[in-house]
Interface confidence: low
C-alpha cells in the first residue's frame, strides 16, 4: 500500500523492572523528512481533539532538544531514517504499547510496538538438538529475548550445578529483525552424562544470578554391560560348571535383544542374561562377551578369557 | 573531531569525467545525509545533491541528474560524487557537507573544498 | 524550483555598524507544521562555509550572540548588531525545504 509509512522493528520487545530497552527501528516517511516525534504509551484517539491521548515518553522539541525529564527515554534515531529507541532504565509499569507518532510536512503516523516488562529477569530457554547420542558432538543453545547495550547481561552453562568446562560462544542481536542473547556450547556428551541436569544459568555484569532454565539430558547409547563368571578367576578343569551373568548397568532406549558371542562369533540358542556350560571340554576355551541391542545400537562387555584345563 | 576532507579534483578535458572522494571521520557515516555543494570561482554556492550512506538512498539538483552521480562507501567512511560530460561551466570548488542534526536541515560540517577545473 | 535572492548583492559598513541583509524566496518556504528551514552561512575567502543560523532565527552552536535571524513566509533577515573585524565576509541564505534546495546568490560584507 503506497499510502503507508514502512517501519521495520521487533513487534514485541522484553525486558524486566530495572533493566532496559533497546528498540531497533527503522522507516521510511511518506513524504520524505520527519518533522516531529511524540513517544506515546498506551495512545488512544481522541475523535473530539483528532489527536491521541496517552502518556507522553518522548517529545521532540521543535528545537531538537530533550528536555532534562525525558532523558530515561531516548530516541537515538533521526529525520529520514532511523527510529531507534531507548528506555533506560525500564519499568513495569512500561509495559503495553508503544506509540511513535511520526509527523513529517504533510503526513502522520502511528507506529505501535509493544513491550513486556516483567517484574523480574524471566529465564531464558534451553534448546537441544532433537536427539542427543553419546560422543557425538551436539550444540546447546541458550536463548534469552533480550539484549540491550545500557544493560550487560552473561549466561553461564552448568552441568549438575558446577561450570561447564567447554567454552561457549555468546553472540547478541540488536536489529530490526531481532532481539536476543544467545549463548551455544559445543558438547560431546558420554552415556554417563544421561539424566543428568543442564542449567542455562542468566547473570548481570557482575555475576549475579538473575534467572535460570534447565533440561535433563537424554542421552541416547548403546547398552553398557557388566559380565561376571563363576569363577570369579574364569579357570576350571574339564567336566566342571561355569556361569556367565551380563549386568546392563545403562541402556536408552530400552534393550531389545541380547546374544552371547564366544571368540567373536555368535552363540546358537543363547539369548538369555545367563549363559551357562556345563561340563566343559576344552574346546570351550574362548574369548566370552555379552552383546545387548537397542535402537542406537549393540553393546558389547569386555570380554572373559575362560581357561578349561584338562582334569 | 567530525572532519570531512575532499579529494580528486584537478584539470580535466570537457567532455571528460572525475570522481571527487569526501573521507569522513569523527561520527558514525551511515546515519548522517552527506550533500554535495559546489561553487564556481567568483559565484556562489550551488547545490547539487545528497546521499544517505547507509542505504544509499539519493536526491539531486535537477540540472546535476543524469551527469552527476553520488555514492557512499560505507566501509570506507567516504562518500563519492562522480562527474560526467563535463563542461567548462563544471568549474567549480566542489565541498561536501554534513547533514548533522536529526530535526533541523543544516550543513554543520564541511570539507575543505577540492578545486575542479574543466578546460581544454 | 525556489529561488532566493538576497539584498544588497554587497555592502560597506565599519566596525561597530549594524548590518542588515534580507533573503526573499520565491515562494513561501513554511509547511504544514510550522517550520521553516532557512539557514544562513557566512564564508571567508578560499574557506568553507560555516553555519551561523538554522530554522530562521536559532543561533547555531558557538555562533556569537550578535547575529540573529528573523522573518517568516517569504522574508527574512540577517542582523548583525554590531559588526566586528572578523565579520568581513560573504553571507548566503539557504532553504532547506523543497528539493531542490537552493542558496540565495550572496552578500558580501566589505570595510567601508
Known amino acids: 500500500d503506497s499510502s503507508k509509512w514502512v517501519f521495520e522493528h521487533p513487534e514485541t520487545l522484553y525486558a524486566w523492572e530495572g533493566a532496559c530497552v533497546w528498540i531497533p527501528c527503522t522507516y521510511r516517511a511518506l513524504d520524505g523528512d520527519l518533522e516531529s516525534f511524540i513517544l506515546f504509551h498506551n495512545p488512544e484517539y481522541n475523535k473530539n481533539t483528532s489527536k491521541f491521548d496517552g502518556t507522553r515518553l518522548y517529545e521532540s522539541t521543535k528545537d531538537g532538544k530533550v528536555p532534562s525529564e525525558q532523558k530515561r527515554v531516548q530516541f537515538l534515531g533521526d529525520k529520514n531514517k532511523n527510529c531507534t529507541l531507548s528506555i533506560h532504565p525500564v519499568h513495569l509499569n512500561d509495559s503495553g504499547q508503544l506509540g511513535l507518532r511520526m509527523e513529517s510536512k504533510t503526513e502522520k503516523w502511528m507506529e505501535r510496538i509493544h513491550l513486556n516488562v516483567s517484574e523480574r529477569p524471566f529465564p531464558p530457554h534451553i534448546q537441544l538438538p532433537p536427539e542427543i547420542q553419546e560422543s557425538q558432538e551436539v550444540t546447546l543453545t541458550c536463548l534469552l529475548n533480550f539484549s540491550c547495550y545500557g544493560y550487560p547481561i552473561q549466561l553461564q552453562w552448568l552441568l549438575e550445578g558446577v561450570p561447564m568446562r567447554q567454552a561457549a560462544v555468546t553472540s547478541t542481536s540488536l536489529t530490526i529483525k531481532s532481539v536476543f542473547t544467545r549463548s551455544e556450547l559445543k558438547f560431546s556428551p558420554q552415556w554417563s552424562h544421561h539424566g543428568k541436569i543442564v542449567t542455562c544459568q542468566l547473570q548481570d555484569a557482575d555475576g549475579k544470578f538473575l534467572s535460570n532454565d534447565t533440561v535433563q539430558l537424554n542421552v541416547k547409547h548403546t547398552p553398557k554391560l557388566e559380565i561376571k563368571v563363576t569363577p570369579s578367576d574364569a579357570i576350571v578343569r574339564e567336566g566342571d560348571s561355569v556361569t556367565m551373568t551380563c549386568e546392563v548397568s545403562s541402556s536408552n532406549p530400552e534393550y531389545t535383544t541380547v546374544s552371547w558371542l564366544k571368540d567373536g562369533t555368535s552363540l546358537k540358542k543363547q539369548n538369555t542374561f545367563t549363559l551357562n556350560l556345563r561340563e566343559v571340554t576344552k574346546d570351550q576355551s574362548g574369548k566370552y562377551c555379552c552383546q545387548v541391542s537397542n535402537d542406537v545400537g549393540p553393546g558389547r562387555s569386555e570380554e572373559v578369557f575362560l581357561q578349561v584345563q584338562y582334569a | 573531531e567530525v572532519q570531512l576532507v575532499e579529494s580528486g579534483g584537478g584539470l580535466v578535458q570537457p567532455g571528460g569525467s572525475l570522481r571527487l572522494s569526501c573521507a569522513a571521520s569523527?561520527?558514525?557515516?551511515?546515519?548522517?545525509?552527506m550533500n554535495w555543494v559546489r561553487q564556481a570561482p567568483g559565484k556562489g554556492l550551488e547545490w547539487v545533491g545528497r546521499?544517505?550512506?547507509?542505504?544509499?538512498?539519493?536526491n539531486y539538483s535537477g540540472k546535476f541528474k543524469g551527469r552527476f552521480t553520488i555514492s557512499a562507501d560505507t566501509s570506507k567512511n567516504t562518500a563519492y560524487l562522480q562527474m560526467n560530460s563535463l563542461r567548462a561551466e563544471d568549474t567549480a570548488v566542489y565541498y561536501c557537507?554534513?547533514?548533522?542534526?536529526?530535526?533541523?536541515?543544516?550543513?554543520?560540517?564541511w570539507g575543505q573544498g577540492t578545486l575542479v577545473t574543466v578546460s581544454s | 524550483d525556489i529561488q532566493m535572492t538576497q539584498s544588497p548583492s554587497s555592502l560597506s559598513a565599519s566596525v561597530g555598524d549594524r548590518v542588515t541583509i534580507t533573503c526573499r524566496s520565491s515562494q513561501s518556504i513554511v509547511h504544514s507544521q510550522g517550520n521553516t528551514f532557512l539557514e544562513w552561512y557566512q564564508q571567508k575567502p578560499g574557506k568553507a562555509p560555516k553555519l551561523l543560523i538554522y530554522?530562521?532565527?536559532n543561533r547555531f552552536s558557538g555562533v556569537p550572540s550578535r547575529f540573529s535571524g528573523s522573518g517568516s513566509g517569504t522574508d527574512f533577515t540577517l542582523t548583525i548588531s554590531s559588526l566586528q573585524p572578523e565579520d568581513f565576509a560573504t553571507y548566503y541564505c539557504?532553504?532547506?525545504?523543497?528539493?531542490?534546495?537552493?542558496f540565495g546568490q550572496g552578500t558580501k560584507v566589505e570595510i567601508k
Open positions: 569523527g561520527y558514525e557515516f551511515s546515519r548522517s545525509w
Open positions: 539557504f532553504q532547506g525545504s523543497q528539493f531542490p534546495y537552493t
Open positions: 546521499i544517505y550512506p547507509g542505504d544509499g538512498d539519493t
Open positions: 530554522k530562521v532565527s
Open positions: 557537507a554534513r547533514d548533522g542534526s536529526s530535526w533541523d536541515w543544516y550543513f554543520d560540517v
